[in-house]
């Protein structure tokens, strides 16, 4: 006669996150009495996952009526899958006594558990930098399993190349997490312009997830000044002024020296905005040239975005 | 469905018998069989359980002077060494107790231990 | 070895009344749930009620229902049947293989 075998007829098992997971068991006999238990992993750390004499486990149900007269079915769904449910499961029959003893094992199902990659998170740097400088950009995502992903970078639609990439950790785990730094160069024309991180997985079913960060948070285009005398508009008025082009962020002051003194400061309000996203802006400055017997030296002093200033100077002329 | 016990009879006291019980419409294989036995006017009293090889067991009473066996279609209880008290009718029954109860039983067969 | 009481050992009922039978165990049965209960009449091999404390067996009536656990077990027939005037046996199994006993039984009657 034979004797009792425990039967796990499905060698590996895969379950996306948050569903249930069928672990199929089935015994050739009734006999000798005693529970089923299941347990994952192996050994003496071996868990507890369901017993059928004994304990309450919320998470887990009989797949057939374990209390039917000649129920050899002990399969069991796990409710609510997570990645940290991966592991070997393992169907153990036990012979009643005091205490019970392990009378056979079946082979084992292996549970992978497949879950979504949170949705990437793009970071830049902490400060603003200039055209042509490199600046570098992170990207991060989290508790997504099997391991296997695939990450792209783009500007404006453009793929990158010069990106490094880190999935951990490097052996096996319940769940894996990506890091990718990218290198940009900044142009005077990226105010407009976006830094995308895709993440694809097996999990999203051909359709990847997206992290987007703008450019307009990381550059700082300076503006060019140009300083011009206007045609006099009163007898002994001159009216100079000062075109502050193609800057980014908004954030200017701007003061009027006269020979060496400040004679007015303010700050950038009415602004017009180009098609690439800087902006323009213009002060004048009226000059009595009546108070001045000599030559007027005229500077106009920008400071952007809390950066040191730049300045622009007109020789203003007085005819005695 | 059924189970049917043969082999009871009269026996003298330190002799031996042997009991079969026979299962027709399902198997024996996947099932313990479990022997019973009920002295005239008394109650029910569990002898054994006989399931494979070496999964047999046994009331303390009966261990050494009973013994149980089964194929596929037939169990078989030996008993030795009988005494007076062990007069009663031996039922099988189909099971092992807990999640596995004793669902179907034979008819029974009168064992008379007597000089 | 693990002892079962039943009591009472005898009772005397009506068709239709409410029957209750206890059974007490020395200790803890098996799993708190190994505890079947048995219906035998005169001349015939008992029948299977009642297992696991509280599962009905195949095709008994409903009118059949076990409750317990540990040590104290009880087999209620809500409304007694003429069919249904016999002896009734628990079955109580301790943590051993080999400790299975019967309790000495209960004969209901008719009033």
């Known amino acids: 006669e034979e004797e009792l075998q425990v039967i796990q007829p499905d060698k590996s098992v895969s379950v996306a996150a948050g569903e249930s997971a069928i672990l199929h068991c089935t015994v050739t006999s009734l006999i000798p009495v005693g529970p089923i238990q299941w347990f994952r992993g192996a050994g003496p750390a071996r868990e507890l996952i369901y017993n059928q004499k004994e304990g309450h486990f919320p998470r887990v149900t009989t797949v057939s009526e374990s209390t039917k007269r000649e129920n050899m079915d002990f399969s069991i769904s796990i409710s609510n899958i997570t990645p940290a449910d991966a592991g070997t499961y393992y169907c153990v029959k036990f012979r009643k006594g005091s205490p019970d003893t392990e009378f056979k094992s079946g082979a084992g199902t292996e549970l992978s558990v497949r879950a979504k990659p949170s949705a990437p998170v793009v970071s830049g740097p902490a400060a603003r930098a200039t055209p042509q400088h490199t600046v570098s950009f992170t990207c991060e995502s989290h508790g997504f399993s099997p391991r296997d992903i695939t990450l792209k970078w783009f500007k404006n639609g453009n793929e990158l190349s010069d990106f490094q990439t880190n999935v951990d950790p490097v052996g096996e785990s319940v769940s894996y997490s990506i890091h990718s730094t990218a290198k940009v160069v900044l142009t005077r024309e990226d105010v407009h312009s976006q830094v995308i991180c895709e993440v694809a997985h097996v999990t999203l079913q051909g359709d990847p997830l997206r992290g987007t960060a703008n450019l307009s948070e990381t550059i700082r285009v300076p503006p060019t000044l140009e300083v011009t005398q206007q045609p006099v508009r009163a007898e002994n008025q001159v009216n100079v002024t000062c075109q502050v082009r193609k800057f980014y962020p908004q954030r200017l002051q701007l003061t009027w020296l006269e020979n060496g003194n400040v004679s007015r400061t303010e700050t950038a309000s009415t602004v017009t905005e180009n098609k690439d996203g800087t902006y323009n802006w213009m002060s004048w400055l009226l000059v009595n040239v009546s108070a001045h017997r000599d030559d007027v030296k005229l500077t106009c002093q920008v400071e952007h975005d809390g950066q040191p200033a730049v300045s622009k100077s007109h020789d203003l002329k007085v005819s005695a | 469905r059924q189970l049917v016990e043969s082999g009871g009879g009269l026996v003298q006291p330190g002799g031996s018998l042997r009991l079969s019980c026979a299962a027709s419409g399902f198997s024996l294989s996947s099932h313990g069989i479990s022997w019973v036995r009920q002295a005239p006017g008394k109650g029910l009293e569990w002898v054994g359980t006989?399931?494979?090889?070496?999964i047999t067991y046994y009331a303390s009473w009966a261990k050494g002077r009973f013994t149980g066996s089964k194929t596929s279609s037939t169990a078989y209880l030996q008993m030795t060494s009988l005494r007076a008290e062990d007069t009663a009718v031996y039922y099988c029954?189909?099971?092992?107790?807990?999640?596995?109860?004793?669902?179907?039983w034979g008819q029974g067969t009168l064992v008379t231990v007597s000089s | 070895d693990i002892v079962m009481t039943q009591s009472p050992s005898s009772l005397s009922a009506s068709v239709g009344d409410r029957v209750t039978i206890t059974c007490q165990a020395s200790q803890s049965v098996y799993g708190n749930n190994d505890l079947a209960w048995y219906q035998q009449k005169p001349g015939q091999a008992p029948k299977l009620l009642i297992y696991?404390?509280?599962t009905l067996a195949t095709g008994v009536p409903s009118r059949f229902s076990g409750s317990g656990s540990g040590t104290d077990f009880t087999l209620t027939i809500s409304s007694l049947q003429p069919e249904d005037f016999a002896t009734y046996y628990c079955l109580g199994g301790g943590d051993d293989e080999a400790d299975n006993t019967f309790g000495q039984g209960t004969k209901v009657e008719i009033k």
């Open positions: 029954a189909r099971g092992s107790a807990w999640n596995d109860p004793f669902d179907y």
């Open positions: 006989i399931g494979t090889g070496v």
């Open positions: 696991l404390a509280s």
